[in-house]
């Protein structure tokens, strides 16, 4: 909360470069989306062109687990990724230009927490600095959304239906259709992060088949129609 912070005004001309890191207090994003964690820094080593390493941690500075690490060779502006947890973290900034900003893909609620950036100069100017005051990532839950619904050919001239939905918490999927009882058990597919897929393996009757996705934030529906062409008698 900003209420406890003390506002400041410039009291003098711009200072010489010292070690510092600038991160926002908070970044908000919705589950399933991507977020950018900004981090810029200043340092006292003018024109440093040696090897460097950029690191992001979660949870705690200094001791928290690394979620991203990349290394740039002397003179190179390319920071070669050495670690990207679950392949979802990517450096957006250019460390040579004092920018360690990170992009996090396919956010889940579990990604909420504090993240800390760190830079290490490993050449002649052997030095390092890490933000003690991390950026807090708040991932908010997402209501269900059906991203794909389709009818596909199945075995023995039958048809099957697939429904893929996303949301956080992951939604529960249910199929309903024209079969007796007006409802069919769906085979719940493997969830992929915030996405869930359910299959209705055998569509036995023509008509409308509806996929319903529901979680604590709401529900979504989508339908497909199956009309098989029956030849003349």
């Amino acid at each position: 909360d900003a209420s406890g912070d003390l506002l400041n005004t410039e009291a003098h001309s711009a200072p010489a470069q010292r070690w510092s890191m600038q991160v926002p207090a908070e970044v908000n994003a919705e589950a399933g989306d991507a977020a950018v964690l900004p981090c810029t820094f200043t340092h006292p080593h003018r024109h440093y062109d040696g090897p460097l390493t950029a690191i992001w941690r979660s949870g705690e500075p200094y001791a928290g687990p690394q979620v991203f690490r990349c290394t740039a060779a002397p003179g190179s502006e390319l920071c070669q990724t050495a670690l990207s947890l679950h392949g979802r973290f990517r450096l957006l900034g250019n460390p040579r230009r004092n920018d360690l900003s990170l992009r996090v893909e396919r956010l889940a609620l579990a990604d909420s927490g504090r993240y800390f950036c760190r830079v290490e100069f490993t050449g002649d100017a052997h030095d390092r600095y890490e933000s003690r005051h991390g950026v807090r990532l708040r991932v908010t839950a997402a209501a269900p959304r059906i991203v794909n619904i389709s009818v596909l050919p199945g075995p023995a001239h039958a048809f099957r239906a697939l429904c893929t939905a996303e949301g956080e918490p992951p939604p529960a999927l249910a199929w309903s259709g024209p079969a007796p009882g007006n409802s069919s058990a769906a085979l719940q597919g493997q969830g992929h992060g915030y996405q869930v897929t359910a299959e209705l393996p055998a569509l036995t009757r023509d008509g409308r088949y509806t996929c319903t996705a529901a979680n604590s934030l709401g529900r979504a529906e989508a339908s497909v129609y199956l009309f098989r062409f029956h030849g003349a008698p």
Partner: antibody
Framework: QVQLVESGGGLVQPGGSLRLSCAAS????????MTWVRQAPGKGLEWVSF????????YYADSVKGRFTISRDNSKNTLYLQMNSLRAEDTAVYYC???????????WGQGTLVTVSS | DIELTQPPSVSVAPGQTARISCSGD??????ASWYQQKPGQAPVLVIY???KRPSGIPERFSGSNSGNTATLTISGTQAEDEADYYC?????????FGGGTKLTVLG
């Protein structure tokens, strides 16, 4: 308003223990690193210890390492300093302070006096 | 360990400019902050990041940092500015304070 209030100081014999508390109000306590700073009578300020938001990361001045333990209870908005094996040279006013985002101390308590004497 | 050195005392006439220095190798790489402490009171932050002033601190307080020396400048010093002043810095892990400077406003 933003406020820090220390308590728990007093007279203790050498080798004894004491626990200081610092009650925070007016800001989101769990969003800040906190610190203890002490000042011996007629002397300057001496940084004692830092603790991170959740309490997982702590740092100590060499003069107190192994004897003092900093901790916090975010549910109670309270910072603690457990002081063991106290020595005469630990006699001081102990201040708790909030660390701002530029590694400076932007809010201070009024202090609590700890006297170590036989 | 990082060390910061301050003069024990500085005197200034009312209305004049007071300058208090703080030197140490850490100041080449890390920002300085300054604290004012009056007798029987807790310290108060007056400058941070070498030259930034918290809200509520008068404009006559300013700061600078060049090389390994940070300087607190009080322009148009007033009687109420008489106090002890401490510089502080941080090396990425620990914090350290200078020994303090007693500012006396003459007259």
């Amino acid at each position: 308003q933003v406020q820090l209030v220390e308590s728990g100081g007093g007279l203790v014999q050498p080798g004894g223990s004491l626990r200081l508390s610092c009650a925070a109000s007016g800001f989101t306590f769990s969003n800040y690193w906190m610190t203890w700073v002490r000042q011996a009578p007629g002397k300057g300020l001496e940084w004692v210890s830092f603790i991170s938001y959740s309490g997982s990361t702590t740092y100590y001045a060499d003069s107190v390492k192994g004897r003092f333990t900093i901790s916090r209870d975010n549910s109670k908005n309270t910072l603690y300093l457990q002081m063991n094996s106290l020595r005469a040279e630990d006699t001081a006013v102990y201040y708790c302070a909030r660390e701002g985002t530029s590694s400076m101390f932007d809010v201070w308590g009024q202090g609590t006096l700890v006297t170590v004497s036989s | 360990d990082i060390e910061l050195t301050q003069p024990p005392s500085v005197s200034v006439a009312p209305g004049q400019t007071a300058r208090i220095s703080c030197s140490g190798d850490a100041l080449r790489s890390y920002y300085a902050s300054w604290y004012q402490q009056k007798p029987g009171q807790a310290p108060v932050l007056v400058i941070y990041d070498d030259n930034k002033r918290p809200s509520g601190i008068p404009e006559r307080f300013s700061g600078s940092n060049s090389g390994n020396t940070a300087t607190l400048t009080i322009s148009g010093t007033q009687a109420e500015d008489e106090a002890d002043y401490y510089c502080g810095s941080y090396d990425g892990t620990v914090h350290v304070f200078g020994g303090g400077t007693k500012l006396t406003v003459l007259g």
